[in-house]
Interface confidence: medium
Amino acid sequence: GCLTQLYENAFFRGGDVASMYTPNAQYCQMRCTFHPRCLLFSFLPASSINDMEKRFGCFLKDSVTGTLPKVHRTGAVSGHSLKQCGHQISACHRDIYKGVDMRGVNFNVSKVSSVEECQKRCTSNIRCQFFSYATQTFHKAEYRNNCLLKYSPGGTPTAIKVLSNVESGFSLKPCALSEIGCHMNIFQHLAFSDVDVARVLTPDAFVCRTICTYHPNCLFFTFYTNVWKIESQRNVCLLKTSESGTPSSSTPQENTISGYSLLTCKRTLPEPCHSKIYPGVDFGGEELNVTFVKGVNVCQETCTKMIRCQFFTYSLLPEDCKEEKCKCFLRLSMDGSPTRIAYGTQGSSGYSLRLCNTGDNSVCTTKTSTRIVGGTNSSWGEWPWQVSLQVKLTAQRHLCGGSLIGHQWVLTAAHCFDGLPLQDVWRIYSGILNLSDITKDTPFSQIKEIIIHQNYKVSEGNHDIALIKLQAPLNYTEFQKPICLPSKGDTSTIYTNCWVTGWGFSKEKGEIQNILQKVNIPLVTNEECQKRYQDYKITQRMVCAGYKEGGKDACKGDSGGPLVCKHNGMWRLVGITSWGEGCARREQPGVYTKVAEYMDWILEKTQSSDGKAQMQSPA
């Protein structure tokens, strides 16, 4: 299953499959997730070790049992791969690291005015993997405002050094934010020239293309089909690069297929997994396990659930079957691809779906009428769970925010439906940043069911929570994916990095904003909050947030939207924007429904086959 917990001051001993330099534990975890054999990782921050060579060291590990002995090491951070973690799987990494220089091959230098501009240049350059930016206060005047675009053989820095007034980060191409655009065409009977960066076996050109997309140095590829004239080269997928970023030449060649990495696609990237099943094909590899199952789909599910399994073959040979069940061979290799592909067999083969973003249909949990005032513009994919709840009675308008918590579920505030409980009139827009981008052709979700908390009463602040079941499940993308929910009764976690987002008013008597706004707001204790709202009861099922001096807050139109906090590198939905006295007033914090207190209710409603059957009318 999916394990998200991080172990502080702990280091996994043994099991090493790769090592690299990464700026933090989260990036190390992402590299582990995408490494075909990595199940566990350990990271050494600069503060944890004196050995300069091991600072920022990221150690990727495998284990037959799925675990390794942990040894105490002050400052070290260890954890699990996010394989099998559905929507949490992403190669996108937005963080900017201050005081850190990520070293690599510097292939381009230019003067820019900000680190964001430097990151944008890297994202818009086909070969750039990461960058460093010297700020205006850098000690050498001639280097100030320099933006260095970089790459390395493995896609990670060749070294990371602590250096004042330098900021570093990664290309946002894996966030589907590149302005370059991509070539979707597949070219039949054409072979590309240039440098081979890797060679793997794949059953078709589409798997080859996906592998190229997620390989740090692949820009284009050539695939040799299973009828290619040289037997030893059949099903070979050659991952390629070139100085210019495009093939320098191409040769007409029977039974070859070529194409490009899709990493530079804007707004949508292919999933980092291969779901197709190949009948009449055997995949060879190291045997992990053999089990009897009924049907090839069950074989794929079995492979997906066994975290080390990379691909499988389901045999229909009479000697491999008994009654209705046949042998399911679960296999793996060093690079995650079959070591041999055979055609015309009585088997069917395919890959594990452990890296698919879709995950299951449940809501995301972890194992353990109110624009934002004082906020700033958000960027694409920054808050991919944020949705806009709009009403189309006559003119269409944004009324509330909401949070995507599963393929078919949105969490919002009950008061959004006061006087408008009709599911027909609502339209739910997800994966958007600007409200002005919504046209008559913009897809939206319709509501199948509105589930208002049974104890919510109109015009009262209590139990201000509602679930929306969508008519059809949504696919997850970099711009549209769910927020994880907190653990039930989560009271021990101290959240210090919390944000409220929405399109609501920018002042008390304002108007709905076009660009999604964000504001960083500190949580306030319930005791402190109660002092500020002596006419109301602040219950333990509420959470408050705001600055003593005011100036930053949620406001009308943000209601139902998320209050999210980042803890151990993971965002969680801590609150639902509910109410407050005015907006951003001094000593008047915003009041939010505390999601952790409603976990039983959320899970009951989302996991029951028919929420309606258990829905009670508001008491």
């Epitope: 009675l393 006559t394 003119a395 027909d424 009139v425 008559k440 319709q446």
Partner: antibody
């Protein structure tokens, strides 16, 4: 092909009733807001009534409120207008129309209702 | 209710002429304004939605402009098939209301 086809019009006496139907084809009827619009002889277009996708919300022009009822059967891809207590001023060609976010993009050919003694 | 006032009531023009029809709303309707063409015995046809967006399949000689209260439909080069009655309609608030229509006749 996306199509709307009205039926049920005819001659009726004042105070009488009539039920108009509109059969939809070529699109997912259950996803669309639908309207009835009419045009009286020598006059302009007049919006009559609307119904939201699942039928849970309806709205009417003041001139027909309380007398006309709009409904739909999504399983049959059909829109209806039940017209009671008909008056001479209800004489018109009645059109059904499909709604997009902004306008009515698909219309039927119309069915004629004549209210006369 | 929002009143929609169309002008002129009718106009005569030659094939090839540039024709402009205006529509005024009694209050701000943003861009929730649509234009329709109606020929006798035929179904009305949506030409322009959202004040300025051309409905697919409609010739580019038709264009719409305006927002708030004042809107215009322009036919840049009138064709024989364009002789018809044109209606504006607001979809900003219920009741949806149409303008009185403008009949475009041949000179």
């Amino acid at each position: 092909e996306v199509q709307l086809l009205e039926s049920g019009g005819g001659l009726v006496q004042p105070g009488g009733s009539l039920r108009l139907s509109c059969a939809a084809s070529g699109f997912t009827f259950s996803l669309y807001l639908m309207h009835w619009v009419r045009q009286a002889p020598g006059k302009g277009l007049e919006w009559v009534s609307s119904i939201y996708s699942s039928g849970g919300f309806t709205t009417y022009a003041d001139s027909v409120k309380g007398r006309f009822t709009i409904s739909r059967d999504n399983s049959k891809n059909t829109l209806y207008l039940q017209m009671n207590s008909l008056r001479a001023e209800d004489t018109a060609v009645y059109y059904c129309a499909r709604d997009t976010d902004y306008g009515m993009d698909v219309w039927g050919q119309g069915t004629t209702v004549t209210v006369s003694s | 209710d929002i009143q929609m006032t169309q002008s002129p009531l009718s106009l005569s023009a030659f094939v090839g002429d540039r024709v402009t029809i205006t529509c005024r709303a009694s209050r701000d309707i943003s861009v929730y304004l649509n234009w329709y063409q109606l020929k006798s015995g035929k179904a009305p046809k949506l030409l322009i939605y959202g004040a300025s967006s051309l409905q697919s399949g409609v010739p580019s000689r038709f264009s719409g402009s305006g927002s708030g209260t004042d809107f215009t439909l322009t036919i840049t080069s009138l064709q024989p098939e364009d002789f018809a009655t044109y209606y504006c309609q607001q979809s900003y608030s219920i009741p949806f209301t149409f303008g009185g229509g403008t009949k475009v006749e041949t000179k």
